[in-house]
Interface confidence: low
């Protein structure tokens, strides 16, 4: 069956370059036109570029024209997107998408690859407890959590008690701070009565920096 | 370029409902319109092309219609698998423009948030920064307003919010709002409060703490 497998995403500094690849299988690559489409975090789909199946014609969105170049290698069944002079606003998941025969809608999509344009360097998070107290208790339920702050790039994973605790857990989407670093919170609601007896540990893993932190969260001792 | 405008941006509905999404083109595109469905973290999936032709394998409850500049996607009887974001796309010109998307969410019953406030940890204060976190847990609908007050003075520009995806079990949302200050600024003030306004609350709820007190 038709498959489009993407590679080449990653973190790149503003002004630098990156090349994305889209390896095709399951159809005669040389007969088909393939497009690039992107999606900025939390935003909609934006068409980026297209190259005719034989490479003679190319079109680009105004936002990338002059900076991005689309190309293809039919012997390798691969489409490329060369991205130069990258800007923070180019941060997005990039998809390659194949048309249906001759009509220019997208019947087949790659899995997507994330491109992050930032001047920030790889950094592991600081993990701080959000300690339960009378201010975080409501009707027999207590809330506690972990603040995972100042890391780059995405993602981090957070589990509780090594995955044993899943009920009542909310791990929020990361926010990008003005520093260019990410921050997120993970919280869990538990019975207030368990606070003295049960141990609560958030397990934070940031693979890009090879950082693992296990933070015990307990009521503040006064 | 031909511009595509979708409405509404969000649509709340229940399983079994008939829902309709509208897409308008800034100029005539004949019937050269496709519809896609996208779920979080996944690539879009083709549903419909040529305005009304159903893609192979797509359930017949998806119905497309329209021509020229006005198009609709109707789901005749909404199923659990249909809660997603939908995009229209014109393919009448070189720039294959998309609509901005319509998110179809589960229509829940009004639920007021449980509100919690967390002071910065001593550990964080040692690093020279203070983050105060306000948690709004398990509420519906999604619209909620959080205001930070420090010694009763309204704060602006120094907080960030994050909202979870809708919970698959109870259709609620949760929100965290983080007020970030330098340690020096944090220690200049005493009372930290987050005030929450939501449809499920008869009046705003305020959670607060006095710095340095348990």
């Amino acid at each position: 069956q038709v498959q489009l497998v993407q590679s080449g995403g990653g973190v790149v500094q503003p002004g630098r370059s990156l090349r994305l690849s889209c390896a095709a299988s399951g159809f005669t690559f040389s007969r088909y036109t393939i497009h690039w489409v992107r999606q900025a975090p939390g935003k909609g789909l934006e068409w980026v570029a297209v190259m005719s199946y034989n490479g003679n014609n190319k079109h680009y969105a105004d936002s990338v024209n002059g900076r991005f170049t689309i190309s293809r290698n039919d012997s390798k069944n691969t489409l490329y997107l060369n991205m130069n002079s990258l800007r923070p606003e180019d941060t997005a998941v990039y998809y390659c998408a194949r048309i249906r025969d001759t009509a220019m809608f997208f019947a087949h999509w790659g899995q997507g690859t994330l491109v992050t344009v930032s001047s920030a360097s790889t950094k592991g998070p600081s993990v701080f407890p959000l300690a339960p107290s009378s201010k975080s208790t409501s009707g027999g339920t207590a809330a506690l959590g972990c603040l995972v702050k100042d890391y780059f790039p995405e993602p981090v994973t957070v589990s509780w008690n090594s995955g044993a605790l899943t009920s009542g857990v909310h791990t929020f989407p990361a926010v990008l701070q003005s520093s260019g670093l990410y921050s997120l919170s993970s919280v869990v609601t538990v019975p207030s009565s368990s606070l003295g007896t049960q141990t609560y540990i958030c397990n934070v893993n940031h693979k890009p920096s090879n950082t693992k932190v296990d933070k015990k969260v307990e009521p503040k001792s006064c | 370029d031909i511009q595509m405008t979708q409405s509404p941006s969000t649509l709340s509905a229940s399983v079994g409902d008939r829902v309709t999404i509208t897409c308008r083109a800034s100029q005539s595109i004949n019937t050269w319109l496709a519809w896609y469905q996208q779920k979080p973290g996944k690539a879009p999936k083709l549903l419909m092309y040529k305005a009304s032709s159903l893609e192979s394998g797509v359930p017949s409850r998806f119905i497309g219609s329209g021509s020229g500049t006005e198009f609709t996607l109707t789901i005749s009887s909404l199923q659990p698998d249909d809660f997603a974001t939908y995009y229209c796309q014109q393919y009448n010109s070189d720039s294959k423009m998309f609509g901005q998307g319509t998110k179809v969410e589960v229509k829940g019953t009004v639920a007021a948030p449980s509100v919690f406030i967390f002071p910065p940890s001593d550990e964080q204060l040692k690093s020279g920064t203070a983050s105060v976190v306000c948690l709004l847990n398990n509420f519906y609908p999604r619209e909620a307003k959080v205001q930070w007050k420090v010694d009763n003075a309204l704060q602006s520009g120094n907080s960030q919010e994050s909202v979870t995806e809708q919970d698959s079990k109870d259709s609620t949302y949760s929100l965290s709002s983080t007020l970030t200050l330098s340690k020096a600024d944090y220690e200049k003030h005493k009372v930290y409060a987050c005030e929450v306004t939501h449809q499920g609350l008869s009046s705003p709820v305020t959670k607060s703490f006095n710095r340095g007190e348990c």
Partner: nanobody, 121 residues
Framework: QVQLQESGGGLVQPGGSLRLSCAAS????????MSWFRQAPGKEREFVAV????????FYADSVQGRFTVSRDDAKNTVYLQMNSLKPEDTAVYYC??????????????WGQGTQVTVSS
Amino acid sequence: QVQLQESGGGLVQPGGSLRLSCAASGRTISRYAMSWFRQAPGKEREFVAVARRSGDGAFYADSVQGRFTVSRDDAKNTVYLQMNSLKPEDTAVYYCAIDSDTFYSGSYDYWGQGTQVTVSS
């Protein structure tokens, strides 16, 4: 007013060949994709082939791939369909159409009146 006029249809035996022409007037075709469609009795009109802009090549329906060749002569404002190894199931009215897009959209502004091709022994 844009007009497209097909010619070259007729009766041909299975295995035989025909060459269809489509002459355009009222629009210079060099910037546009030109397509051939066909409609058999009682069936929907189906795509056959497209000649994209000069140098941008052609695309064919699977049913005619390897047997039909589409070409264009922009100086003569004409597109051609060379049909070889014809089969009875190729019997249809053949239409040419001019695309609204300079690239290829599958969106057709103008159609010819059609020319009948009958493949029979």
